[in-house]
C-alpha cells in the first residue's frame, strides 16, 4: 500500500493591489494534482500580522483570498493542500506548508510619521481627519493622505487639505458613497528634502467614528403633579431615530444634578411642586444597533423653566 502524498500549493504570495492594507493572498495548484481529479481539493490558509498571537484560519477551494491588514507591521501567511478522506480511502492527507511574508520597506525613522491622527465622521455625512506633524520634522515636510474602501477602483488622494503654516495637517473628505459598514483604509505619507518620512496606515469603519449633531427642539410637558416629561427631536441629517442613544443632564433648582442615558427622545422626571427652576441639556451618540462605537455629540443648547407653574403650559424653546 503506497502512502498517498500531495504537494503544497505553488507560487504562494501576498499581493498588494495598492489598496493601503487590503491584500490578496494567492497561490497556484500543487504539482501533480491531476491524480486527484475526481476530488475537491481544499486549501488551509493561515495568516496574521507579525506580532499578533493568533492566526486567522480559512479553508477554501479557491486559489485566492482577500483580507485587510495593518501595513505598519509585516504580514506572514502559510498554506497547505488538504485532500479530504473521500479522496484517500481513509484519513485526510495534508501537504507540507508553503510560507510567505510581506511588508512595506519602511522609510524614515518612526518619529517622522504623523502624530495623533484623529478621524471623525460628522453626522454620518462628512469625514474629517486631522493630525500633527512628526516629531522634529522641518517645515518643508508635507504630508499626503490617501484612502480606499471597497467600491473604489483605486486609492484616492485627499483633494481638500486643512493647512497650518503651509503644512497639511488634515483632510476634509468629499461625499463618500456607500462607504460605511466596510473597512476604510488610510495612508498618510510624507515628503521632505531633508530626510525620508515614515508612512502611517490606519483602518476603521466609518459608522464607528460618527459624531452626530446635538438634539434639537427641547421641550417640557407637565404629565402630572409630580412628573415632567422632557422631550427633544433627533438632529437633522441622515441618521435614523433607531440609531440614537441620548445622555441627559438635568439641574433642579441649581442643586440636584441628574444624568441619565436613554434610547428614546423622551425622559420623565419626578419633581415636587416646589421646583422653582428646571434646566436640561441632551447629547446624542450612535447606539449599538447601528455601530460598535461612536462619539458623543456636543451638548444641545440649554432649555430652562424658571418661576412659572409648569402645570399651566408647555415650554418650547
Amino acid at each position: 500500500d503506497t502512502e498517498i502524498k500531495v504537494n503544497p500549493p505553488q507560487d504562494f504570495e501576498i499581493v498588494d493591489p495598492g489598496y493601503l492594507g487590503y491584500l490578496y493572498l494567492q497561490w497556484q495548484p500543487p504539482l501533480s494534482l491531476d491524480h486527484f481529479k475526481e476530488c475537491t481539493v481544499e486549501y488551509e490558509l493561515k495568516y496574521r500580522n507579525i506580532g499578533s498571537e493568533t492566526w486567522k484560519t480559512i479553508i477554501t477551494k479557491n486559489l485566492h483570498y482577500k483580507d485587510g491588514f495593518d501595513l505598519n507591521k509585516g504580514i506572514e501567511a502559510k498554506i497547505h493542500t488538504l485532500l479530504p478522506w473521500q479522496c484517500t480511502n481513509g484519513s485526510e492527507v495534508q501537504s507540507s506548508w508553503a510560507e510567505t511574508t510581506y511588508w512595506i520597506s519602511p522609510q524614515g525613522i518612526p518619529e517622522t510619521k504623523v502624530q495623533d491622527m484623529d478621524c471623525v465622521y460628522y453626522n454620518w455625512q462628512y469625514l474629517l481627519c486631522s493630525w500633527k506633524p512628526g516629531i522634529g520634522v522641518l517645515l518643508d515636510t508635507n504630508y499626503n493622505l490617501f484612502y480606499w474602501y471597497e467600491g473604489l477602483d483605486h486609492a484616492l488622494q485627499c483633494v481638500d487639505y486643512i493647512k497650518a503654516d503651509g503644512q497639511n495637517i488634515g483632510c476634509r473628505f468629499p461625499y463618500l458613497e456607500a462607504s460605511d459598514y466596510k473597512d476604510f483604509y488610510i495612508c498618510v505619507n510624507g515628503s521632505s528634502e531633508n530626510k525620508p518620512i515614515r508612512s502611517s496606515y490606519f483602518t476603521f469603519q466609518l459608522q464607528n467614528i460618527v459624531k452626530p449633531l446635538p438634539p434639537v427642539y427641547l421641550t417640557f410637558t407637565r404629565e402630572s403633579s409630580c412628573e415632567i416629561k422632557l422631550k427633544w427631536s433627533i438632529p437633522l441629517g441622515p441618521i435614523p431615530a433607531r440609531c440614537f442613544d441620548y445622555e441627559i443632564e438635568i439641574r433642579e433648582d441649581d442643586t440636584t444634578l441628574v444624568t441619565a442615558t436613554v434610547e428614546n427622545e423622551t425622559y420623565t422626571l419626578k419633581t415636587t411642586n416646589e421646583t422653582r427652576q428646571l434646566c436640561f441639556v441632551v447629547r446624542s451618540k450612535v447606539n449599538i444597533y447601528c455601530s460598535d462605537d461612536g462619539i458623543w455629540s456636543e451638548w444641545s443648547d440649554k432649555q430652562c423653566w424658571e418661576g412659572e407653574d409648569l402645570s399651566k403650559k408647555t415650554l418650547l424653546r
Epitope: 505553488q10 507560487d11 504570495e13 494567492q26 504539482l31 501533480s32 494534482l33 491531476d34 481539493v41
Partner: antibody
Framework: EVQLVESGGGLVQPGGSLRLSCAAS????????MSWVRQTPDKRLEWVAT????????YYADSVKGRFTISRDNAKNSLYLQMSSLRAEDTAVYYC???????????????WGQGTLVTVSS | DIQMTQSPSSLSASVGDRVTITCKAS??????VAWYQQIPGKAPKLLIY???YRSTGVPDRFSGSGSGTDFSFIISSLQPEDFATYYC?????????FGGGTKVEIK
C-alpha cells in the same frame, strides 16, 4: 474584452538591448501569472519567461537566463521583458500571454497578445 | 527538460474528415497537456488544457485525451475554419515546452 497588446519590438544589433511592454485590459491583472512566449522564424513556439501574479516568483528558459528580465507593474496593468546581450537566435515574434488558472491546473496560456517582432541582425 | 514530440508535422484533410494529432512527452506529465490552434498571421489560441478540458467557447468537435506520456487531439468533423497549425504544450513543471506543431492543410 480581455486584451493584451505588446509593443517595443524592432531591429537591434547582436549584443544590443530592447525592452518589450505588454498592456493588459479587461481582467484583474494582479490575479494572473503572466508569460512571454516567442515564435521563431521556423514557426516553433518557445516559452521564454513567467512571472507570478504578485511578482514574487519568476521562471526563465535556460536559453535566456541571465540575459532577459521579466517584470510586471500591477498598478499599471503592464508586463515587461528587458532583453540584453541579444543574439541572432533571439529573432522571433514575442507574445505576451496570460497564465490560465483553474482549480486543477495552471501554466497553460489562455489569452495571447498579437505579438511584436524582434529582429536581431547586424 | 521535458520534450514534446508531436506528429504528424503536417497532414492534408477534407472538410468533414476526422483528424487525429498525437503528442508524446519524454516523461510522465500526468494530464498537464494543452493544445493550441494558430491561424496564419494570428496569435495561438487555447483549445484544450489538462489533456481533456475544453477552453471557454471552444466547439465540442475539438477534444483531447491521454495521460502520462501519450496524448491525442481530435477534430471530429473538420470545418473550413479549422485549417491551421496545432501545437501541444505540457504545463507540468518549468520549463514549459511545446511540440513542433502540426499543419492541417486542405486536401
Amino acid at each position: 474584452e480581455v486584451q493584451l497588446v505588446e509593443s517595443g519590438g524592432g531591429l537591434v544589433q547582436p549584443g544590443g538591448s530592447l525592452r518589450l511592454s505588454c498592456a493588459a485590459s479587461g481582467f484583474t491583472f494582479s490575479r494572473n501569472g503572466m508569460s512571454w512566449v516567442r515564435q521563431t522564424p521556423d514557426k516553433r513556439l518557445e516559452w521564454v519567461a513567467t512571472v507570478s501574479s504578485g511578482g514574487s516568483y519568476i521562471y526563465y528558459a535556460d536559453s535566456v537566463k541571465g540575459r532577459f528580465t521579466i517584470s510586471r507593474d500591477n498598478a499599471k496593468n503592464s508586463l515587461y521583458l528587458q532583453m540584453s546581450s541579444l543574439r541572432a537566435e533571439d529573432t522571433a515574434v514575442y507574445y505576451c500571454a496570460r497564465q490560465g488558472t483553474t482549480a486543477l491546473a495552471t501554466r497553460f496560456f489562455d489569452v495571447w497578445g498579437q505579438g511584436t517582432l524582434v529582429t536581431v541582425s547586424s | 527538460d521535458i520534450q514534446m514530440t508531436q506528429s504528424p508535422s503536417s497532414l492534408s484533410a477534407s472538410v468533414g474528415d476526422r483528424v487525429t494529432i498525437t503528442c508524446k512527452a519524454s516523461q510522465d506529465v500526468g494530464t498537464a497537456v494543452a493544445w493550441y490552434q494558430q491561424i496564419p498571421g494570428k496569435a495561438p489560441k487555447l483549445l484544450i488544457y489538462s489533456a481533456s478540458y475544453r477552453s471557454t467557447g471552444v466547439p465540442d468537435r475539438f477534444s483531447g485525451s491521454g495521460s502520462g506520456t501519450d496524448f491525442s487531439f481530435i477534430i471530429s468533423s473538420l470545418q473550413p475554419e479549422d485549417f491551421a497549425t496545432y501545437y501541444c504544450q505540457h504545463h507540468y513543471s518549468a520549463p514549459w515546452t511545446f511540440g513542433g506543431g502540426t499543419k492541417v492543410e486542405i486536401k
